[in-house]
């Protein structure tokens, strides 16, 4: 499957289906990842206007925050994006979905922070192992999107310096037990797994021991699979436009899709005086579609030159990927040129905008 251009493809995104209303879904994302929250309508069909809220404040769409009626994407997430997110019905403010999002450090490889937590001479004559950074070990459940890197750490000390070994689901865990292997960094008391997959789910236990004793800590890893979805169109685009007769107009449509999307621009038309067919589908004509030499960038813009009154009406940006369609529509209003307005005023006529 072609992934298309970087600006459109959201790398390492976890699409999280919305929990039942009333439930709060606890989610953990890595720094730099795309947080993607999904709140499908109860019936799979339209659910009316919605708003996304973070910590009680409505989210404003931006280059980084993509707000759709059923999905929210926060690109390149950072710690500041942690918080309580909810999708609400605009009119009633009823909470449809509720998520608790935490963005943590999830380095793309296990090599940063080297040197931290290394075995150190504590000055203690002899002693059983103990945790040197227990505050770094309080997150027992880690839920990460597939393809991310996971690092489990058990910083410890003791005299003599203890050894560390790892178990998965209670059994010895070695590199040959997973495709892609593992990195054991004894100096950092860590286990690193790159590009995690669903089969990596399970309980991981570090066992730290010396001749005076043994301590252990168990972490639970959940790997969130990416779920396919229809293209996401940026909220507010295309935007309604008002133009003067003879001027040029541009409609914009920003499409985000894992799979290469098809993009088309449609104009709504009337057939035998009707705007919709017998099944309620609007009658449309295709204005712009992918051609041999058309780039996706070009398809995201519809340009209308020297507009006439016939150009007024409803326009739709239609995007489709491997599993479905998404669309956003906007209206173009064409006003008479200023000279015509002046003449009309002198004649005592009134034009409705």
């Amino acid at each position: 499957e072609s992934l298309g251009t970087e600006q459109r493809v959201v790398g390492r995104a976890a699409e999280v289906p919305g929990p039942e209303p009333g439930q709060q879904e606890q989610l953990v994302f890595g720094s730099g990842d795309a947080v993607e929250l999904s709140c499908p309508p109860p019936g799979g069909g339209p659910m009316g206007p919605t708003v996304w809220v973070k910590d009680g404040t409505g989210l404003v769409p931006s280059e980084r925050v993509l707000v759709g009626p059923q999905r929210l994407q926060v690109l390149n997430a950072s710690h500041e994006d942690s918080g309580a997110y909810s999708c609400r019905q605009r009119l009633t403010q009823r909470v449809l979905c509720h998520f608790s999002v935490r963005v943590t450090d999830a380095p793309s490889s296990g090599d940063d922070e080297d040197g931290e937590d290394e075995a150190e001479d504590t000055g203690v004559d002899t002693g059983a192992p103990y945790w040197t950074r227990p505050e770094r070990m309080d997150k027992k459940l880690l839920a990460v999107p597939a393809a991310n890197t996971v690092r489990f750490r058990c910083p410890a000390a003791g005299n003599p310096t203890p050894s560390i070994s790892w178990l998965k689901n209670g059994r010895e865990f070695r590199g040959e037990h997973r495709i892609g292997g593992i990195k054991l960094r004894h100096q950092q008391w860590s286990l690193v797994m790159e590009s995690v997959v669903p089969s990596d789910r399970g309980n991981y236990t570090c066992v730290v021991e010396n001749k005076f004793g043994s301590i252990r800590q168990t972490y639970t890893l959940d790997v969130l699979e990416r779920s396919p979805h229809r293209p996401i169109l940026q909220a507010g685009l295309p935007a309604n436009q008002t133009a003067v007769l003879g001027s040029d107009v541009e409609f914009h449509c920003k499409v985000y899709s894992d799979a290469q999307p098809h993009i088309q621009w449609l104009k709504h038309v009337e057939v035998n005086g009707s705007k919709v067919g017998p099944d309620g589908t609007p009658y449309v004509t295709v204005l712009k579609t992918a051609g041999a030499n058309t780039t996706d960038k070009e398809l995201e813009v519809l340009s209308l030159h020297n507009v006439t009154f016939e150009d007024a009406g409803e326009y739709t940006c239609l995007a489709g990927n491997s599993i479905g369609f998404s669309h956003h529509s906007a209206w173009l209003v064409v006003l008479p040129a200023e000279e015509e307005l002046v003449e009309a005023d002198e004649a005592g006529s009134v034009y409705a905008g």
Epitope: E15, P40, S227, D279, T281, L318, S322, I323
Partner: antibody, heavy 124, light 107 residues
Framework: QVQLVQSGAEVKKPGSSVKVSCKAS????????ISWVRQAPGQGLEWMGG????????NYAQKFQGRVTITADESTSTAYMELSSLRSEDTAVYYC?????????????????WGQGTLVTVSS | DIQMTQSPSSLSASVGDRVTITCRAS??????LAWYQQKPGKAPKLLIY???SLQSGVPSRFSGSGSGTDFTLTISSLQPEDFAVYYC?????????FGQGTKVEIK
């Protein structure tokens, strides 16, 4: 009332081809995705492939790749499924099914409307 | 391809019984799951989509639940017209795939 009406039963020889039609009445044909699903006698349902007329694109199941061709004629609101190199195990009822339209739920492969089925018998 | 596994493959029940059919996907499919009912010689009929949404015109005794990999179709009180074959179907991934079917027979 939107309907999908399929062509009649066919009896074919092994090695030959069959072309089944599916005409949509009472709807805006190109706005929907049309798929073909088959069911061998006493067996389950199997998706063969689908076409999205508005984009002019088709997808096929790996199993049928190279043997099946799905086309659509927007002027007559008709979809076609042609299966070549027929063998006895292709004996089945072939259904056309309508997936999501761009103004409905939008999922190409969520079928809410089916044709009545066309029995294709492959026998020497 | 995503494999859909239904259980049981057949069941016998009486009118008025509560019937549950389960479906498991070989990998997560979010809520992209539908249930179809098929009677002999007829085309399948959509009952449930988006895992739990009732298709219009379908009696409310049919309900669906689940998300991810495990899904359930429940018929709260079996009626004579409900004896049929039921298929689960995932539509969120190419190729879309059906379960092998569950035949609900009269006891």
């Amino acid at each position: 009332q939107v309907q999908l009406v399929q062509s009649g039963a066919e009896v074919k020889k092994p090695g030959s081809s069959v072309k089944v039609s599916c005409k949509a009445s009472g709807g805006t044909f190109s706005s929907y995705a049309i798929s073909w699903v088959r069911q061998a006698p006493g067996q389950g349902l199997e998706w063969m492939g689908g076409i999205i007329p508005i984009f002019g694109t088709a997808n096929y199941a790996q199993k049928f790749q190279g043997r099946v061709t799905i086309t659509a004629d927007e002027s007559t609101s008709t979809a076609y499924m042609e299966l070549s190199s027929l063998r006895s195990e292709d004996t089945a009822v072939y259904y056309c099914a309508r997936g999501g339209g761009w103004v409905s739920h939008g999922y190409y492969y969520l079928f809410d409307l089916w044709g009545q089925g066309t029995l294709v018998t492959v026998s020497s | 391809d995503i494999q859909m596994t239904q259980s049981p493959s057949s069941l016998s029940a009486s009118v008025g019984d509560r019937v549950t059919i389960t479906c498991r996907a070989s990998q997560g499919i979010s809520s992209y799951l539908a249930w179809y009912q098929q009677k002999p010689g007829k085309a399948p009929k959509l009952l449930i989509y988006a895992a739990s949404s009732l298709q219009s015109g379908v009696p409310s005794r049919f309900s669906g639940s689940g998300s991810g990999t495990d899904f359930t179709l429940t018929i709260s009180s079996l009626q004579p017209e409900d004896f049929a074959v039921y298929y689960c179907f995932q539509y969120g991934s190419i190729p879309p795939t059906f379960g092998q079917g569950t035949k609900v027979e009269i006891k």
